[in-house]
Amino acid sequence: QEGNHEEPQGGLEELSGRWHSVALASNKSDLIKPWGHFRVFIHSMSAKDGNLHGDILIPQDGQCEKVSLTAFKTATSNKFDLEYWGHNDLYLAEVDPKSYLILYMINQYNDDTSLVAHLMVRDLSRQQDFLPAFESVCEDIGLHKDQIVVLSDDDRCQGSRD
């Protein structure tokens, strides 16, 4: 199955643009509870040189702070390295760039290892369509349905998205 592996225009760049967080999951519930380190929300993404740059919204003191992060490519095509509250192996588990994206992270912080998954969509009005896919990916990586938190508009910094 040889092929042209040079990424063409419209390759990883298809992930660029606005995204909306829909659901989070973790084996450590404190991480995704309000004020948890991983209760963060995607605002937008861009791709350059095979790396993913994300603007995320972090709730802080009743407001939302926008922070820029970069996930660096690795030798494995769907795996990226991200430094955020320790080291994260970030995996893009299931992707449709025009519709939804499911990622999960293996986080290592102070000798503690955690698993966090994130569902994001392009169009919030279709968020229910992709929850079954998220539940399925969570199941595949060992997270149960009761470890999933579906976000509401109030949760995800909707007022801070401009």
């Epitope: 419209g10 390759g11 299931e94 449709d96 760039p97 519709s99 399925s136």
Partner: nanobody, 125 residues
């Protein structure tokens, strides 16, 4: 084990049309991509078009955009490639492929796990 069978190839005049079909049998993934790739003699296999089973999202190589259309029938596990305004440079063996919605399925062959045997398309001038 998934099996993919292509059909519909053949010889056609330039500016003509063909419809390729790919039938998948066996156990597929929950959500998957089906793609078409092609390989001309002496060239590398290249992406042509792909579609997601759950969303119907489609992607095309720049060289075929506006001329080719990919469509799916999930109930029958088939994907068709409608090829119009064919050019001699479209001559190649066309392969159908199936895989999960891994990063890159919309432009790259690597995310695909299963491949058909290919069907020859020849466009004469």
């Amino acid at each position: 084990e998934v099996q993919l069978v292509e059909s519909g190839g053949g010889l056609v005049q330039a500016r003509g049309s063909l419809r390729l079909s790919c039938a998948a049998s066996g156990r597929t993934f929950n959500n998957y991509a089906m793609g078409w790739f092609r390989q001309a003699p002496g060239k590398e296999r290249e992406f042509v078009a792909a579609i997601a089973s759950n969303t119907g999202t489609t992607y095309y190589a720049g060289s075929v955009k506006g001329r080719f259309a990919i469509s799916r029938d999930n109930a029958k596990n088939t994907v068709d490639l409608h090829m119009n305004s064919l050019k001699p440079e479209d001559t190649a063996v066309y392969y159908c492929a199936l895989g999960p919605l891994r990063l890159g399925w919309w432009y790259d062959s690597r995310p695909y796990d299963y491949w058909g045997q290919g069907t020859q398309v020849t466009v004469s001038s």
